[in-house]
């Protein structure tokens, strides 16, 4: 007789990531009976929300429903009926809604309201949406790297089965770039964490980890440009800016009340004399490496060191994922190669910068201009961030991997969110059985 | 601003194939799905399906799946319709569109000027 | 699928008359878009989620409704309105349009 496949048991979980730019929708899924068995949930689809993200629809929530419904909808396709009412969501937002929620507890308030109404009217089982911290975002970011990595798994392997796999259990940190904040989260080598804000610990699959992380607000490449302009205007002559960070021949104008709009650039907050000002790039890698530092703050550390603006970090150790925009900046500039080294980084940087805006907009003719016109920055500001605000140095580079995605699911902290609050990472090894069960009869 | 520039009209026979394209400029074509809707002389209008350039995922409405295959050439900006074994009543306009929020979450809808199907022997 | 029934289907206002198009759904829909289609051109978004006009849409024009019952209501007709009309929903697929309200010349 023939062997039948029986149906499939398996689970599925959401996970909505709010974030500054953009809103994304993760299906995981994994087999039921293997739930605490590591590196069994895999993502299975992104669908990226069209539109800004959620703290832009401050002056109209009421449009909030229509903004998710598409993405909403593709879940409802792609998790089968049967699942739809035991499949959870959650909604975690960032560091846009961090800053909204500086600006106004209310306004947060209400847009997370509509949030969980319109996500309610769907027939999942909706957990809650919610502002997630920058320390839980550098953490799930660290378990969701190394989960997929299989770091947790206490089999050891001749072979290797992931990319980046170095055979030892040695854990990798994570280095997140978003819009609005950066996160670095890594293990010290035996070293204290001598700021408790910056210290987590851990028991995963029988094993402790004292990890350390921080979140920089208004570090992520969005807030980063506009803190950058609003510096750099504070001691313009008049009201042209002829800024290093963007190309020969690019211009913009800015309208002052925009600039002074995020909490990030209050520090900067003057009185000018005009109510807008022309962006004028001369393309300058160096130059615009130099604007960029001034944005660290590197003359105060209460500690035995730090990164910058006087927030402790332990030397680095190890190799590290770079992800989310980290990834997407570099991925673009070509430069996730693990064959790049630092200098050769530097010295594509310096050319790309040099390029003509109107050469530039030729050979791209598919990206929208507000993109195109910030990878210079961008590219230059994760330099910066990597060496000066990290400490990373030529040497240490090649221990940085861009990474977008690992086994297929994309590197991020919603799937270590996810797995947290589904209980699917135990503390304790789980008690390995002899037979896996046969999905067949 | 956005722009969707369609191919011109086309006249074919039963039976044949036909790829009509729509080239879109003036935004990021990975940020919106672009669908495409079919409107018969005189008649209503009615969703075909759409593809989402980011994900290169395709949806369709029942009535036009098979016969019908979206496309997208992300190099040149451009999404594709391709409609195998006419009939007469696939005689039409064919509008690709998109709608969305914009990066100050404007909401916006724009379409093509229409690709005229003719399919006559 | 979700059914879009819009009544009437045609109309003959006289200019400066109050208008009310009706759009019904077969099952509830979060919002309710509406476009202008006029001979020849392709359909323009006039009203979308429901109340909100899109951009240039003059103040006249007006929607409203929820569940399975939408209305656009024109307070004042003019000219320039005479046109097909169609509803839309965006809220499940396959997406779907009314078959029309045509606004004629009397």
């Known amino acids: 007789t023939q062997n039948k496949a029986l149906p499939e048991n398996v689970k599925y979980g959401i996970v909505l990531d709010a974030g500054s730019s953009h809103t994304s929708l993760y299906i995981y899924k994994w087999p039921a009976e293997k739930e605490n068995d590591t590196g069994v949930v895999h993502q299975v689809e992104e669908c990226r929300v069209k539109g800004p993200g959620i703290s832009k629809f401050v002056q109209k929530v009421n449009e909030i429903g229509i903004y998710l419904t598409d993405c909403m909808e593709r879940a409802r396709e792609v998790i089968p009926r049967s699942q739809h009412q035991e499949t959870p969501v959650y909604l975690g937002a960032t560091a846009g809604m961090r800053l909204l929620r500086m600006e106004s507890e209310e306004l947060a308030d209400r847009v997370l309201d509509v949030v969980e109404r319109s996500l309610s009217n769907y027939p999942f089982d909706f957990q809650g949406a919610r502002i997630i911290t920058g320390q839980e975002e550098g953490a799930y970011g660290w378990i969701t790297i190394n989960y997929l990595l299989g770091k947790f798994s206490q089999k050891t392997r001749w072979f290797s089965i992931v990319p980046y796999e170095t055979n030892n259990q040695e854990t990798f940190g994570a280095l997140d770039l978003g819009g609005a904040s950066t996160q670095v989260t890594f293990v010290p080598q035996n070293q204290t964490i001598e700021s408790p804000d910056n210290a987590l610990q851990f028991r995963l699959y029988g094993k402790d980890y004292n990890v350390y992380t921080h979140s920089f607000l208004c570090y992520g490449k969005d807030q980063a440009l506009w803190q950058k302009l609003a510096k750099d205007i504070q001691v313009a002559s008049n009201e042209i800016l002829r800024d290093p960070c963007f190309h020969p021949g690019y211009k913009k104008v800015v309208n002052v009340s925009d600039l002074y709009k995020t909490p990030c650039t209050k520090r900067f907050e003057m009185t000018l004399p005009f109510q807008q000002f022309e962006i004028q790039g001369i393309g300058n890698y160096q130059q615009c490496h130099q604007s960029i530092l001034e944005l660290f703050n590197t003359s105060y550390c209460p500690y035995s060191q730090c990164a910058f603006n006087g927030i402790f970090l332990p030397p680095l150790q190890g190799d590290f994922g770079a992800f989310s925009a980290f990834y997407f900046v570099m991925k673009f500039l070509n430069l996730t190669s693990e064959k790049v080294s630092q200098e050769k980084v530097t010295e594509m940087m310096k050319k790309f910068c040099a390029q003509p805006w109107e050469e530039i907009k030729t050979s791209y003719a598919g990206v929208k201009e507000k993109y195109l016109s910030e990878y210079c920055f961008s590219g230059t500001y994760i330099l910066s961030l990597l060496l000066q605000g990290y400490h990373f140095t030529a040497d240490s580079w090649e221990h940085i991997h861009f990474i977008g995605k690992i086994q297929g699911s994309d590197a991020g902290w919603t799937l270590g969110y996810m797995l947290n609050l589904t209980n699917m990472i135990p503390a304790e090894q789980p008690l390995s059985t002899p037979l896996s069960h046969s999905t067949y009869v | 601003e956005v722009q969707l520039l369609q191919s011109g009209p086309e006249v074919v026979k039963p039976g044949a194939t036909v790829k009509i394209s729509c080239k879109v400029s003036?935004?990021?074509?990975?940020?919106?799905?672009l669908n495409w809707v079919k409107q018969p002389p005189g008649k209503n209008l009615e969703w075909i399906g759409n593809i989402d350039p980011y994900s290169g995922g395709t949806r369709y409405n029942q009535k036009f799946k098979g016969r019908f295959t979206i496309t997208i050439d992300q190099s040149i900006n451009t999404a594709y319709m391709e409609l195998r074994s006419l009939t007469s009543e696939d005689t039409a306009v064919y509008y690709c569109g998109l709608y969305g929020y914009d990066d100050d979450a404007n909401y916006f809808d724009d379409w093509g000027q229409g690709t005229m199907l003719t399919v006559s022997s | 699928e979700i059914v879009l029934t819009q009544s009437p289907a045609i109309l003959s206002p006289s200019p400066g008359e109050r208008v009310t198009l009706n759009c019904s759904a077969s099952s509830s829909v979060s919002y309710m878009h509406w476009f202008q289609q006029k001979p020849g051109q392709a359909p323009r978004l006039w009203i979308y989620?429901?109340?909100n006009l899109a951009s240039g849409i003059p103040a006249r024009f007006s929607g409203s409704g929820s569940g399975t019952e939408y209305t656009l209501t024109i307070s004042r007709m003019e000219s320039e309105d005479f046109a097909v009309y169609y509803c839309q929903q965006r809220s499940s697929y396959p997406l779907t349009f009314g078959q029309g309200t045509k606004l004629e010349i009397k």
């Open positions: 003036g935004y990021s074509f990975t940020d919106y799905n």
């Open positions: 989620a429901t109340s």
